[in-house]
């Protein structure tokens, strides 16, 4: 029961996490740009992995895609790749984990197969979560190191007057969504891996079979009713796996006057 709950919870947590990773990847608010002393008008800029948007004080919003690949920083391309890999792995993991769920019966699938599938999906979720966390962290690092406080000195012409305009880059909502979603996917993956241990069928413990050579005692095998005496090849408490063998715990048969052949 606990295994089923752990597996089910892992699946749900991973599902929420992957939905979050997809949402973060599609969101436009990865970074926001503010001008400290904007000399023109109140305009708010924010950027995602795929396009840049502007929102005016009037409420007008317009977005424009990054149509060039060559002009984009390599880091941005890396972040895109990490997020897409995370989504793809997560989606495959979800597909695998649906069939691995203990509560879902598909044909005559054995527990060992479900255990393997659960482990596979768990590993996929872990890698997916790590990809998302890595992608978001790389982007955040790119903002902090390259763009955080960009100061531009511009001449206004006559007199050589200079105005310094500072652009402040701040973390957008998508970064936090990505971090949380990646964490959830990671946790879900760990839960699936834990559930896998409980699903995996352990080796069956067969009790040792002992034969006592007491008089003319006979062990009866149901298959064809062929009798074997206690003095045969199985005298050393070997495990035998046919239904005719009786263990020490069972009631011993007493010697009878007749041997049934």
């Amino acid at each position: 029961m606990a295994v089923t709950a752990c597996q089910g919870l892992g699946f749900v947590v991973s599902l929420i996490g992957i939905a979050g990773i997809i949402a973060a990847t599609c969101m436009d608010q990865w970074s926001t740009q503010d001008l400290y002393n904007n000399p023109v008008t109140a305009v708010f800029n924010y950027q995602g992995l795929w396009r840049s948007c502007v929102r005016e004080s009037s409420g007008f919003t317009e977005c424009r895609g990054y149509f060039t690949l060559l002009g984009l920083p390599a880091m941005l391309q890396a972040v895109r790749a990490l997020m897409i890999v995370g989504i793809v792995l997560g989606a495959i993991g979800l597909l695998v984990s649906i069939f691995a769920l203990k509560c879902i019966r598909i044909g005559s699938m054995e527990d060992s197969a479900k255990a393997n599938m659960t482990l596979t999906s768990g590993i996929m979720f872990i890698v997916s979560g790590l990809c998302a966390i890595a992608g978001v962290s790389v982007f955040a690092n790119m903002l902090v190191t390259n763009f955080w406080m960009s100061t531009a000195n511009m001449y206004t012409g006559m007199g050589g007057m200079v105005q310094t305009v500072q652009t402040r880059y701040t973390f957008g909502a998508a970064l936090f969504v990505g971090w949380v979603a990646g964490g959830l996917t990671l946790i879900g993956g760990v839960m699936m891996c834990i559930a896998c241990r409980g699903l995996a069928p352990e080796e069956t413990n067969y009790k040792a079979v002992s034969y006592h050579a007491s008089g003319h005692s006979v062990a009866y095998k149901p298959g064809g009713f062929k009798a074997s005496t206690g003095f045969g090849s199985n005298t050393k408490n070997k495990k035998i796996y046919d239904g005719g063998a009786r263990t020490e715990d069972e009631v011993q048969s007493y010697p009878s006057k007749h041997d049934y052949v």
Epitope: Q33, L35, N38, P39, V40, T41, V43, N45, Q47, S52, V54, E56, S57, S58, G59, F60, T61, E62, R64, Y66, T68, L70, G71, L72, P73, L76, F147, S150, A152, M154, Q163, V165, T167
Partner: nanobody, 122 residues
Framework: QVQLVESGGGLVQPGGSLRLSCAAS????????MGWYRQAPGKQRELVAA????????NYADSVKGRFTISRDNAKNTVYLQMNSLKPEDTAVYYC???????????????WGQGTLVTVSS
């Protein structure tokens, strides 16, 4: 690199008209807003008019309201300032200002033109 090229300044009689234009060129991703500032000799620089390129919201200094009109041409990345009923106190160097996003993964910066002189005198 981004360049702002201003034109249209000159000498005009009081009550006359002038049309200033400012064209932005270079590695521009998009334009947030453009505007005109002016600086008369011995005075502080002041905003004359500004316009956002997306929605076309405008902002005017009280001293020019009703006389000056700012407009933009998105396709040409150009802003225009139509100045009517000019007064001697409008004499100043007029500077173009542009709030731009520049580059492939755009960075926001404010750029200034070199200025064009407008003289209102009889």
């Amino acid at each position: 690199q981004v360049q702002l090229v201003e034109s249209g300044g000159g000498l005009v009689q009081p009550g006359g008209s002038l049309r200033l234009s400012c064209a932005a060129s270079g590695s521009i991703f998009s334009i947030n807003a453009m505007g005109w500032y002016r600086q008369a000799p011995g005075k502080q620089r002041e905003l004359v008019a500004a316009i956002t390129f997306g929605g076309g919201s405008t902002n005017y200094a009280d001293s020019v309201k009703g006389r000056f009109t700012i407009s933009r041409d998105n396709a040409k990345n150009t802003v225009y300032l139509q100045m009517n009923s000019l007064k001697p106190e409008d004499t100043a160097v007029y500077y173009c200002n542009a709030d731009l996003l520049v580059g492939g993964f755009p960075r926001r910066n404010v750029y200034w033109g070199q200025g064009t002189l407008v003289t209102v005198s009889s």
